[in-house]
């Protein structure tokens, strides 16, 4: 009974339940391979509970091990499109602070139009995650085709 | 010590640990694109702890943010099969109540025989998730090739 | 306040937060399809908190339901490479104890160079997970392209 009461009294954030699910806002200017994300209940089913967006990039607020997941679908795409414009590659990484810059997750489209993956990785407060789409193909902005999220798993 | 005791005494369900992993039971009749799922220890490694099955579709019993994941493999498939019978698409969505109907996750097979993805999404008690496979290809019923599951992550 | 103190005093392991993320060490000798994994902070972003490695295979230390995830990318691969050397298949399963041997997750590469998936599955203390890559193609050892992990979800 005491535990249940305590659990209700503590804010969720203190339990370390940081979580975010983002939808694509837009791509960057021509020389910027980054995807720019947005989130919040007004936009549909995206949300940020703990992490924040900094100019369309996801910034972590709590140290811990996170499950990072992503799906990106190319717009109006067929296997022919994908193979003709190869290589198209998606990389998720820590892009700042620069001292912690590293690629966490990388996939190529080859003859497919969608990539989807996930991984566990340690992240620290202040880490900003960038998702770089290299190539000349535009990603779909449909919220069920392109999304990016993180879930705090443990300290 | 007190916390450990309290944790043991509280039923797991009260901690919000709803989780389910399902295996394919069968496809629907010709005009019904839904996949029908089954779960339970008697069937192998599938299970339902919290959510329930309603005529082969997964119904949520606890409000919260969930990780939804799915893998579907097409039966006796080669890249030739997949491309010849294109488009074959898998969509996971809330199909009832009708007021909350929305597509959560969508992938096409293109020249591949398997799709796999996952996403975080808010779900409410009573939401029923449907998995629609459009196209004319039969999915594999092997339990290591086709499966669908949800995991409660936080309120 | 009491709950917060108790949580800090208890070792994380007692909360059941077992988790591991591994990177590829090497492939097996010619007749051994298993991938051999490694993990630890000295190697980069891989880690083991609870599970252990036994000759490159992941051994579970706590009963429960786990989220198992994997991504494998083939080395210096194009869709032509993948299709010419088809079938290349990745299977994740319990390989010991022999009495519990079962395939949990299986994917073929077809014309793609990367497979990625995840599933929920019950695992028991002492279960050893093996990842078998059948075919003649070498997997990439890049840590952002090939990785394997588990996360304890609930008892």
């Amino acid at each position: 009974q005491r535990f249940a009461q305590a659990q209700q009294q503590l804010p969720l954030e203190s339990l370390g339940w940081d979580v975010a699910e983002l939808q694509l806002n837009h791509t960057g200017p021509q020389q910027d391979p980054r995807l720019y994300w947005q989130g919040g209940p007004a936009l549909g089913r995206s949300f940020l509970h703990g992490p924040e967006l900094d100019k369309g990039q996801l910034r972590i607020h709590r140290d811990g091990i996170y499950m990072v997941h992503i799906q990106v679908t190319l717009a109006i795409c067929s296997s022919t499109t994908a193979s003709r414009h190869h290589p198209t590659t998606l990389a998720v990484g820590i892009c700042s602070p620069a001292s912690r810059s590293i690629s966490l997750l990388r996939l190529s489209f080859h003859q497919g139009c969608t990539i989807a993956s996930q991984r566990l990785t340690p992240l620290a407060r202040g880490d900003t995650l960038c998702t770089n789409l290299t190539g000349t193909l535009l990603p779909s902005r449909n919220t069920d085709e392109t999304f990016f999220g993180v879930q705090w798993v443990r300290p | 010590q007190r916390f450990a005791q309290a944790q043991q005494q509280l039923p797991l369900e009260s901690l919000g640990w709803d989780v389910a992993e399902l295996q394919l039971n069968h496809t629907g009749p010709q005009q019904d694109p839904r996949l029908y799922w089954q779960g339970g220890p008697a069937l192998g490694r599938s299970f339902l702890h919290g959510p329930e099955l309603d005529k082969g579709q997964l119904r949520i019993h606890r409000d919260g943010i969930y990780m939804v994941h799915i893998q579907v493999t097409l039966a006796i498939c080669s890249s030739t099969t997949a491309s010849r019978h294109h488009p074959t698409t898998l969509a996971v969505g809330i199909c009832s109540p009708a007021s909350r109907s929305i597509s959560l996750l969508r992938l096409s097979f293109h020249q591949g025989c398997t799709i796999a993805s996952q996403r975080l999404t808010p779900l409410a008690r009573g939401d029923t998730l449907c998995t629609n496979l459009t196209g004319t290809l039969l999915p594999s019923r092997n339990t290591d090739e086709t499966f669908f599951g949800v995991q409660w992550v936080r309120p | 306040q009491r709950f917060a103190q108790a949580q800090q005093q208890l070792p994380l392991e007692s909360l059941g937060w077992d988790v591991a993320e591994l990177q590829l060490n090497h492939t097996g000798p010619q007749q051994d399809p298993r991938l051999y994994w490694q993990g630890g902070p000295a190697l980069g972003r891989s880690f083991l908190h609870g599970p252990e490695l036994d000759k490159g295979q992941l051994r579970i230390h706590r009963d429960g339901i786990y989220m198992v995830h994997i991504q494998v990318t083939l080395a210096i691969c194009s869709s032509t490479t993948a299709s010419r050397h088809h079938p290349t298949t990745l299977a994740v399963g319990i390989c010991s104890p022999a009495s519990r041997s079962i395939s949990l997750l299986r994917l073929s590469f077809h014309q793609g160079c990367t497979i990625a998936s995840q599933r929920l599955t019950p695992l028991a203390r002492g279960d050893t997970l093996c990842t078998n890559l059948t075919g003649t193609l070498l997997p990439s050892r890049n840590t952002d392209e090939t990785f394997f992990g588990v996360q304890w979800v609930r008892p």
Epitope: - | L24, L74, A75, I76, H85, T136, L137, P139, N142, T146 | -
Partner: antibody, heavy 120, light 111 residues
């Protein structure tokens, strides 16, 4: 109801080609595949090939060098052409609709058959 | 190619009795959680008619006295009780891989 109606010659000269048209009704050729199967007393039922909704074809390797299957969706017609016929190609030739599932390869509706004799 | 062997070649059976026809493949036709074996009925002067697909599923309009079973390499078609209109030749067909092949047929006759 679903129907497949075949039209084609009954007699073919040796080394000549055989052409059969299968006209379908009450289903779409853009959705369903159509198989060709032949039946002879000596060889029983033999699968020859199939054309899928998207226009792709799969052939029995034993016939691939002399068989062409094509179609015109707008006319609901499937065309079968086999070259270089010999006496042992004498058989009843059937077109048949593939069951709804494209990777099931069962044939749920059949044409009435075209009896073909190869003889000079 | 997968070879299908049907037995018996001819099966005399009395009205109301059970008819059992066997089909054996020289390699497994089961995959992906299904058995890719189908059964057809053919009457003289008519094309074959699909009875059962995926080893055990009755096609629409097929009477419930027909049933199929089996997996891997061994399959069975059962008819019970046999009726007069069941006099025909029955064929099995696999679809595990190309080329699709058929059994040589079993002729069901009334005693």
């Amino acid at each position: 109801q679903v129907q497949l109606k075949q039209s084609g010659p009954g007699l073919v000269q040796p080394s000549q080609s055989l052409s059969i048209t299968c006209t379908v009704s009450n289903f779409s050729l853009s959705t369903y595949g159509v198989h060709w199967v032949r039946q002879s007393p000596g060889k029983g039922l033999e699968w020859l090939g199939v054309i899928w909704g998207g226009g792709y074809t799969d052939y029995n390797a034993a016939f691939i060098s002399r068989l062409t299957i094509s179609k015109d969706n707008s006319k609901s017609q499937v065309f079968f052409k086999m070259n270089s016929l010999q006496a042992d190609d004498t058989a009843i030739y059937y077109c048949a609709r593939n069951n709804y599932y494209g990777n099931l390869y069962a044939m749920d509706y059949w044409g009435q058959g075209t009896s073909v004799t190869v003889s000079s | 190619d997968i070879v299908l062997t049907q037995s018996p070649a001819s099966l005399p059976v009395s009205l109301g009795q059970r008819a059992t026809i066997s089909c054996r493949a020289n390699k497994s036709v089961s995959a992906s959680g299904y058995s890719f074996m189908h059964w057809y009925q053919q009457k003289p002067g008519q094309p074959p008619k699909l009875l059962i697909y995926l080893a055990s599923n009755l096609d629409s309009g097929v009477p419930a006295r027909f049933s199929g079973s089996g997996s891997g390499t061994d399959f069975t078609l059962n008819i019970h009780p046999v009726e007069e209109e069941d006099t025909a030749t029955y064929y099995c067909q696999h679809s595990r891989e190309f080329p699709l092949t058929f059994g040589a047929g079993t002729k069901l006759e009334l005693k």
